[in-house]
Interface confidence: low
Amino acid sequence: QLPPGKPEIFKCRSPNKETFTCWWRPGTDGGLPTNYSLTYHREGETLMHECPDYITGGPNSCHFGKQYTSMWRTYVMMVNATNQMGSSFSDELYVDVTYIVQPDPPLELTVEVKQPEDRKPYLWMKWSPPTLIDLKTGWFTLLYEIRLKPEKAAEWETHFAGQQTEFKILSLHPGQKYLVQVRCKPDHGYWSAWSPATFIQIPSDFIMND
């Protein structure tokens, strides 16, 4: 029977800069029941706080609700693992909420085949930003990426859409059924998961772009 091994805070993510969650990996348990606590202070302060919510993020997590999230402050945090034989501490992790945002996927992806009379046909897609993100505040610039592939193909074709919430693609294989997905990321932060796939059937008379 030994003291617990050193835990590691391996990930912190925020969906919207207003709340965030951090997760840790336990070290070895030393063969005894082990209790974990996360303590933190905001940089420039000496007073320590304990994690406000160990429940919301699931096992081995600490969730910081809206009230505990300061966007312009760096959090310095550490996890303490304790059993009857002793304690061990993770390394300190410095977290700036601005840099850990991972939004939810974009919403309402719609895809249409457009066949204007005077121009080549194209695939037109549009989507909405995730609801948790308030773009009006100016705190966010969201960038988007689209991927699509014929249903039975292995490889995805990826297009960067910048800040647009709509996009046109001209080069497609007639008669194929395509899967289309979109994801987003803030200017500083992480890509969201891909949105659920939207399917679109390309007509057999769709004219390939020269």
Epitope: K66, Y68, S70, M71, W72
Partner: antibody, heavy 117, light 107 residues
Framework: QVQLQESGPGLVKPSQTLSLTCTVS?????????WNWIRQFPGKGLEWMGY???????SYNPSLKSRITISRDTSKNQFSLQLNSVTAADTAVYFC??????????WGQGTTLTVSS | DVQITQSPSSLSASPGDRITLTCRAS??????LAWYQEKPGKTNNLLIY???TLHSGIPSRFSGSGSGTDFTLTISSLQPEDFAMYYC?????????FGQGTKLEIK
């Protein structure tokens, strides 16, 4: 409904120790949140003194750190304030309050404490 | 510590009036300012936090704005029950600090 109620002696002599208790009903102080003491001086100014969190950790205002202790009795769902070496400058209305993430969403009615010989 | 200056120290107004109270911080506190209402015989009431977030159960006639060092609490149409003492509190830095209060009186 969460309710907080302060209790204490009302009068303390200079250099003695002030002891106040806050009884919480409608919520367990070990479930969540931090449980604070705040005082209001006769001129109406408010000062945050410190807290004890649901886990038992404490934070104190640096201006009081050498004199203050906040503790709790979980069996009675109470937390307490001790302030050593009081002077007339500690005369105030003392409030207990629940910390809703750096702000205070539930307060007690307050108890008046006079330091006088 | 962050100093909070609240103005005016007292204000006379009539029911139905729109009034604005001000708090100024001695340094940048971003959006992290709260407002409370104090009435005799009642417990203090949290109105607004994070500058503009209305606490649950607070009427929409109360609103907060500002960031950095300058903040305002606006009551759009005063009701008789709004005549009270109002305090602001910064919640960006330790230790938490409060303004000296504004007494809102019936004209």
């Amino acid at each position: 409904q969460v309710q907080l109620q302060e209790s204490g002696p009302g009068l303390v002599k200079p250099s003695q120790t002030l002891s106040l208790t806050c009884t919480v009903s409608g919520y367990s102080i070990t479930s969540d949140y931090a449980w604070n003491w705040i005082r209001q001086f006769p001129g109406k100014g408010l000062e945050w003194m410190g807290y004890i969190s649901y886990s038992g950790s404490t934070s104190y205002n640096p201006s009081l750190k050498s004199r203050i202790t906040i503790s709790r009795d979980t069996s009675k769902n109470q937390f307490s304030l001790q302030l050593n070496s009081v002077t007339a400058a500690d005369t105030a209305v003392y409030f207990c309050a629940r910390d809703y993430g750096y702000v205070f969403d539930y307060w007690g009615q307050g108890t008046t404490l006079t330091v006088s010989s | 510590d962050v100093q909070i200056t609240q103005s005016p120290s007292s204000l006379s107004a009539s029911p139905g009036d729109r009034i604005t109270l001000t708090c100024r911080a001695s340094k940048n506190i971003y959006k992290y300012l709260a407002w409370y209402q104090e009435k005799p015989g009642k417990t203090n009431n949290l109105l607004i936090y994070s500058g503009s977030t209305l606490h649950s159960g607070i009427p929409s006639r109360f609103s907060g704005s500002g960031s950095g060092t300058d903040f305002t609490l606006t009551i759009s149409s005063l009701q008789p029950e709004d005549f009270a003492m109002y305090y602001c509190q910064q919640h960006n830095d330790y230790p938490y600090t409060f303004g000296q209060g504004t007494k809102l009186e019936i004209k």
